[in-house]
Structures are given as C-alpha cells and as structure tokens.
Interface confidence: medium
C-alpha cells in the first residue's frame, strides 16, 4: 500500500485497462489518471467509472475526442443505453503530451481537473456508490492511476497535537495565464503531477498545486523541526519534491530522509563539519555504503538560503540544489510507492515544502 487507508496505485497499466476501485466510490475520494495522449493512432480516449467490467453500466464516461476541433463528451450508460451527451467544446489535452487528470467525487457531482485546472463538473445521474471499477481505453498511454482518500493523508509536522482531519479539496481555479507543463529532464519529460504545498498555520492543512504553477509561498511561522509529512501516493517516476529553507549560521548538519516504513530509502545529509553531502540508505537499522562525490563545490552554505529539488526517475533520484544538478542516487529500495514519508531535521529552518 502506498499509504494506509488508501488503495495502492496502478502503475504503468496497459490500455485498455480495467481495475477495481476498492470500497467503491466515496464522497471525497480523488482519483488521478496520469499519462500521455498518443500522437500516432486514434482520435479518442475514455475514462469510465462503472459497475463491474461489462461496460453496460457507466456512471461517468469521460471521453476526449480529437475531432472537429476537439471536444470532450461526458455521459452515463445504464443497462447498455447511453443518456444525453454533455459536451465541452474546449479540448484541454494535446496529442503527444502528458496530462494529469484528477476526478474528485463529491456528493452532487464529479469535479474533473486537467493539469491542475478545473475543467468540468458532471452531476450524478446514478448513485455513485454503485461504482466499483475504473476503465481506460483508447489512444492513451498510462503512467499510473492513484487513489487518494482525504481522511488518510494528513500534512503532519512532527510532535503536533493538532488533529488533522480536514478534507483535501481541489484548489481554486488559478487566476491569470496558465503555464504549460515544464520540460524537466530531457530523456523523460516529467508530466504534471499532483503536488501538495505544505504550510504551517494555526490550522495546518494542505493545498494542491502542480509544477505547472510556480511554487506559492504562504505566510507561516517556522516549520517545526523535525518536520515529518506524508508523500501522497509515494514515489513514482516523474514525482518531484521541492524543499527550501535557510541553513542556520552555526549549522553542523541537517538531513532530508525519504522513508518507507522503518527504512530510510534515501538519506541526504549535508555535513558542514566535514564539508560533505553524504547520501545513504538504511534498511532494518543498518546503513549501507555512503556516497559523497559531487560535481562541484559544497552547495550549502551556513546562514544562506537554499532549495533542494528531488526528482524520482525509474532507476534513480536526481537531486538539484539551487537549480543546479548535484548528484544522482540509484534506488536501493525499489518499491517506490512505499516510499511515502518525508522527514527533515537538523540545523536548518524550513520555509517551504512541496511534495
């Protein structure tokens, strides 16, 4: 499981795909379909929320069509018969381009976001609790399908006594011009993926954004240290984590850990007392061999601000500091979705965390 209480994601499923939604649809459940529209074949794809695998009962049929200028059809099928179509004449997908498609189930409707932007609301025509299956077909390649139960993914600083039970909700529609997804690493351009921006306020909560929207900074007191939070859905190829902060003037060391259960899959440990950036993995309380090589001088400086950008790829983590590549760390724990906890501690003050 990627995180307790939520269904593990389907990773790189073949299309056509049909998979069970464990426990069926529930109010507040968010389902993310991440993939790429094929540029070569076909003019349509569809995501269906249905009862069983037959395709005769589809509560919500979401069907982008690259025809007649592009449009999206939404519909419901009952006992093999389609109802009236609802058409959206705007086409938010592009052939050959990655996408992040999020469905939020609410009591009255499905809210659909494409690449972080609210695209359409589809009001329920049949009771959504009958839905137990998601299917995807057509001209699309899938990276993953993930499930997020809002009651199981708190943003929880260490030692906090505040209960975290606010529902996760879609962000307000961003104002102004929407940016296109970033071309991040050339060999495998990162699709836009759901991001949590962690803020520490009187009632800590969470807000969703995407790497397509520049990181937003919110006024907040200093993050409690150590800082511990859940990584929604765990790691997967293209997942980005961004942290920024300031090194304390008298700093000796700090660490950023990506954890899986009791294991530390990735331990990033800048040491000012050794002028080194140590990387390692701890499995069952046993450390492996350290990695210390750097392509340039120690990028962390006492008293100075920094940002660390961690990109997960299939074989390794890529780490940049202040926008410049620092090293690659090849996965030693390879069950990426189980790496679902971020821990930060030591001689820094955190100003921003985005997972």
């Amino acid at each position: 499981m990627a995180f307790s209480g939520s269904q593990a994601p389907y990773l790189s499923p073949a299309v056509p795909f049909s998979g069970t939604i464990q426990g069926g649809l529930q109010d507040g459940l968010q389902i993310t379909v991440n993939g790429t529209v094929l540029s070569s074949s076909g003019t349509r794809f569809a995501v269906n929320f249905q009862t069983g695998f037959s395709g005769n009962d589809i509560a919500f049929h979401f069907n982008p069509r690259f025809e007649d200028g592009g449009y999206v059809v939404c519909n419901t099928r009952q006992n093999g018969s389609w109802g009236p179509e609802e058409r959206k004449t705007h086409m938010p997908f592009q052939k050959g381009m990655p996408f992040d498609l999020c469905f939020l189930v609410q009591s009255s409707d499905f809210k659909v976001m494409v690449n972080g932007i609210l695209f359409v609301q589809y009001f329920h025509r049949v009771p959504f609790h009958r839905v137990d299956t998601i299917s995807v077909n057509g001209s699309v390649q899938l990276s993953y399908i993930s499930f997020q139960n809002p009651r199981t993914v708190p943003v929880q600083p260490a030692f906090s006594t505040v209960p975290f039970s606010q529902p996760v909700c879609f962000p307000p529609r961003p104002r102004g011009r929407r940016q296109k997804p970033p071309g991040v690493w050339p060999a495998n351009p990162a699709p836009i993926t759901q991001t949590v921006i962690h803020t520490v306020q009187s009632a800590p909560g969470q807000m969703f954004s995407t790497p397509a929207i520049p990181p937003m900074m919110y006024p907040h007191p200093a993050y409690p240290m150590p800082f511990i939070t859940t990584i929604l859905g765990g790691l997967y190829p293209s997942k980005s984590i961004l942290l920024s902060g300031t090194v304390l003037p008298s700093a000796q060391r700090f660490h950023i850990n990506l954890c899986s259960g009791n294991h530390i899959a990735f331990h990033l440990n800048p040491r000012f007392d050794e002028n080194a950036v140590v990387r390692n993995t701890q499995i069952d309380n046993s450390w492996g061999s350290e990695e210390r090589s750097l392509p340039r001088k120690m990028p962390f400086v006492r008293g100075q601000s920094f940002s660390v950008w961690i990109l997960c790829e299939a074989h390794c983590l890529k780490v940049a500091v202040d926008g410049q590549h620092l090293f690659e760390y090849y996965h030693r724990l390879r069950n990426l979705p189980t790496i679902n906890r971020l821990e930060v501690g030591g001689d820094i003050q955190l100003t921003h965390v985005q997972t």
Partner: antibody
Framework: EVQLVESGGGLVQPGGSLRLSCAAS????????IHWVRQAPGKGLEWVAA????????YYADSVKGRFTISADTSKNTAYLQMNSLRAEDTAVYYC??????????WGQGTLVTVSS | DIQMTQSPSSLSASVGDRVTITCRAS??????VAWYQQKPGKAPKLLIY???SLYSGVPSRFSGSRSGTDFTLTISSLQPEDFATYYC?????????FGQGTKVEIK
C-alpha cells in the same frame, strides 16, 4: 513548449544603458537558473550573468560585474539584464538560456546590442 | 575561475569521417561539462551533458567522454548537417565558462 524570447536590444552610445528582457513560458520559471550569454560578432560564446529566481541568487562574469544587473520577475516569468556604462566591447548578440540542471537546454533567438558612437 | 581550453580551433572533415574535439579544464570540474552545437545565425543547442550523457533528441553519432580534466566530443560519422561550431562548457560553479569553440568545416 518551453520558450525564451529576448527583447530590448538596439544601438546605444558608449556609456549608455539598455535593459534586455527574457520572457519565459512553458516551464516553472522560478525553479530554473536563467542565464545571459553573449556572442560578439565572429567570436565565441561568453557567459555574462545568471539568476536563480527562486531565491533571487545572482552570478556575474568579472567583465560585467558592477555594470550589469540581472533580475527576475516571477509574476511575469521574465528575466532582465540591466546594462549600464556600456562599452564597445559589449557589442554582441545576447542570448538568454534556461539553466537546465546539466547545462543550458533551451535558448532564445538572441537580441543584438550594438555599442557605437 | 575555471578555464576551458578547446582544441582544435577549426578542422576540415568529410561526410562519414570520425571527428574528435577536446576540451581541457584548468582544474577539476568532475563531470560537470556540457557540449553545444551552433550554426551561423542560430542559438546554440545542447548535445551532451554530464560529460557523456546524450541530450534528448540528439543523434547517437554524438558522444562524450571524460578522462580526468580532459573532455572529448566525438562524432562517429559526420553528416552534412553536422558542419557547425562546437563549444564545451563547465558548470561546476559560477562563473560558467565556455571553450573557445571548434569550427567543423567541409574538406
């Protein structure tokens, strides 16, 4: 699609000033280093300055330090190069480039700056 | 500052030839070296990063290697579209520095 578009070049007298703009789109502007690189007529590439918008960290070549100022407006996804006390040897095509982690992966088309009396 | 000394400054070659361009760093830059191709009137294009990694979309006839502070760009079989000027660049730390360039001309 990642795009960088420079503007603001032109003819200026020695000692004069000019401000170049680099409008970026298609990526998360504040996460990448933005560089200015110039190329004098018939010469090679010379790195001029860079900024990391996320923290507004700036870097300069010795040849322009104290005369040029690099800045960025993350709300406009635009980087600027303010050039003061211009000299004849500053005549060049000025490119802005995105500092990909491993170098400069996207470049603008360039804008020509001519310093002459 | 780290200096990048590139050689040769120019070379003449024929289609199908194997071409090698070298760059020497004045001090250790680890593998933080990139190679670019530039054609007249155009912006440079990234070919190689991290000394030996091929940038997305670049033909596999281009390759890079490192030996200590010496860096090499190799074109295994020169094609008509490869006639251009090539630059190395180090990004170990600011100031970022380029080599002087190597112009590859038709023999």
């Amino acid at each position: 699609e990642v795009q960088l578009v420079e503007s603001g070049g032109g003819l200026v007298q020695p000692g004069g000033s000019l401000r170049l703009s680099c409008a970026a789109s298609g990526f998360t502007f504040s996460w990448y280093v933005i560089h200015w690189v110039r190329q004098a007529p018939g010469k090679g590439l010379e790195w001029v300055a860079a900024i990391y918008p996320y923290h507004s960290k700036t870097y300069y070549a010795d040849s322009v330090k104290g005369r040029f100022t690099i800045s960025a407006d993350t709300s406009k996804n635009t980087a600027y190069l303010q050039m003061n006390s211009l000299r004849a040897e500053d005549t060049a095509v000025y490119y802005c480039a995105r500092g990909y982690w491993y170098g400069m992966d996207y470049w603008g088309q360039g804008t020509l700056v001519t310093v002459s009396s | 500052d780290i200096q990048m000394t590139q050689s040769p400054s120019s070379l003449s070659a024929s289609v199908g030839d194997r071409v090698t361009i070298t760059c020497r760093a004045s001090q250790s830059v680890s593998s933080a070296v990139a190679w670019y191709q530039q054609k007249p009137g155009k912006a440079p294009k990234l070919l190689i990063y991290s000394a030996s990694s091929l940038y997305s979309g670049v033909p596999s006839r281009f390759s890079g290697s490192r030996s200590g502070t010496d860096f090499t760009l190799t074109i295994s079989s020169l094609q008509p579209e490869d006639f251009a000027t090539y630059y190395c660049q180090q990004y170990t730390d600011a100031p970022w520095t380029f080599g002087q360039g190597t112009k590859v001309e038709i023999k």
